[in-house]
Interface confidence: low
């Protein structure tokens, strides 16, 4: 698989990527609370608060191509990437490299994909090969998670996440995966 | 190459509790969507729970507030606790990777048998 | 809510081509091209045999293709063969519960 970059609207340079993007490491085992510095607490947040418009994250645009094996989508897909760590939406800089950014004192707060939405893509193979086509999973909204006392994989709280999914009753758009999972890119899942 | 392996069936009584493993080998466990799928004797296909990576759960209506998904990626295992069993929950369970919104591999299945 | 509608049954003879339809009540079916078919032999798993309405995985003949018309999808099987005397299930996702929906299943017997 190729590694070839381009840029995005945020002027970074992004990788030739799969599909699935790959939880922080802080998520991939029980331990990251149990230190003996935090007494295995999460340490305290003077932000804390019950208003949960008042916690935001990033969610940067890029642009990135599909690939399956040899094969590579005719146009890259645009989708979100939800940066870094979460604070209080009015800490937080409008546009990148503006602004302050606030960063709690421990590894407890993540800004992680929300929503996802999926795309068909058409994937053109080198050697004559018939195009193929793809469906994928897009990013198309984030959220902050909190990690919570003694955590596990699934022991995370939500903050400001209802207003992003679709009200009870209402269909979301087709194949809108109302879903939350990973963040930085992974293996091609073929 | 890619293997999924189900253990933990067995029979159980009415109300009981089972736990339902799946070990995964052949790929990067921790980046994919793993479903548990279910089919009772002579019957059909059935989905019963899908885990995200991040550890984020959904379950159909049939076994919402019985059943708990999980997984470890530090071991490569995708679980499924099952609790208040019923008649009706007697099937063949499969675990399967989710892949592109269609499940590409499946484990050969483990039965659970719900009976007095 | 999708579901997803299959014959109980289809039958032909070796060499012949069969199609098993599946139907869905939601025009998602029709709009999306998000279709499965999966294969199931009697004490097996399923096996993946479309994706996509007519995508193959590596490995999976090609006598086997998928198709779409409005909200009916179709899996037809050209030259049947006695090993692909089976269990066929359609099957899509389903947005709003984030689930797998799989159509009742249709027996494929070869004659």
């Known amino acids: 698989q190729g590694w070839q970059a381009f840029k995005n609207d945020a002027t970074e340079i992004i990788p030739e990527l799969g599909e699935y993007p790959e939880p922080p490491p802080e998520l991939e085992n029980n331990k990251t609370m149990n230190r003996a510095e935090n007494g295995g607490r999460p340490p305290h947040h003077p932000f804390e608060t019950k208003d949960v418009s008042e916690y935001s994250c990033r969610e940067l645009h890029f642009t990135r191509y599909v690939t399956d094996g040899p094969c590579r989508s005719a146009k890259p897909v645009t989708e979100l990437v939800c940066s870094g760590q979460c604070g209080p939406a009015r800490l937080l800089p409008n546009a990148i490299g503006r602004g302050k950014w606030w960063r709690p004192s421990g590894p407890d707060f993540r800004c992680i994909p929300d929503r996802y939405r999926a795309q068909r893509v058409q994937l053109l193979c080198p050697g004559g090969e018939a195009p193929r086509a793809r469906k994928v999973r897009l990013v198309a909204s984030c959220k902050c998670k909190r990690l919570t006392r003694f955590h596990n994989q699934s022991e995370l709280k939500d903050f400001g996440t209802e207003a992003a999914r679709p009200q009870k009753g209402r269909k979301p758009r087709p194949r809108a995966r109302s879903a939350k999972a990973n963040q930085a890119e992974l293996e091609n899942a073929y | 190459q890619v293997q999924l392996v189900e253990s933990g069936g067995g029979l159980v009584q009415p109300g009981g509790s089972l736990r339902l493993s799946c070990a995964a080998s052949?790929?990067?466990?921790?980046?994919?969507?793993l479903s548990w799928v279910r089919q009772a004797p002579g019957k059909g296909l059935e989905w019963v729970s899908v885990?995200?990576?991040?550890?984020?759960?959904y379950y159909a209506d049939s076994v919402k507030g019985r059943f708990t998904i999980s997984r470890d990626n530090s071991k490569n295992t995708l679980y499924l606790q099952m609790n208040s069993l019923r008649a009706e929950d007697t099937a063949v369970y499969y675990c399967?990777?989710?892949?592109?919104?269609?499940?590409?591999?499946w484990g050969q299945g483990t039965l659970v048998t719900v009976s007095s | 809510d999708i579901a997803l509608t299959q014959p109980a049954s289809v039958s032909g003879s070796p060499g012949q081509s069969i199609t098993i339809s599946c139907t869905g009540t939601s025009s998602d079916v029709g709009d999306i091209n998000d279709v499965s078919w999966y294969q199931q032999h009697p004490g097996k798993a399923p096996k993946l045999m479309i994706y996509?309405?007519?995508n193959r995985p590596s490995g999976v003949s090609n006598r086997f293709s998928g198709s779409k018309s409005g909200n009916t999808a179709s899996l037809t099987i050209s030259g049947l063969q006695a090993e692909d005397e089976a269990d066929y299930y359609c099957s899509t996702y389903d947005g709003p519960g984030l689930s797998e929906v799989f159509g009742g299943g249709t027996k494929l017997t070869v004659l």
């Open positions: 996509d309405v007519n």
């Open positions: 885990i995200t990576p991040y550890g984020d759960t």
């Open positions: 052949g790929f990067t466990f921790r980046s994919h969507w």
């Open positions: 399967a990777r989710d892949t592109y919104l269609h499940f590409d591999y």
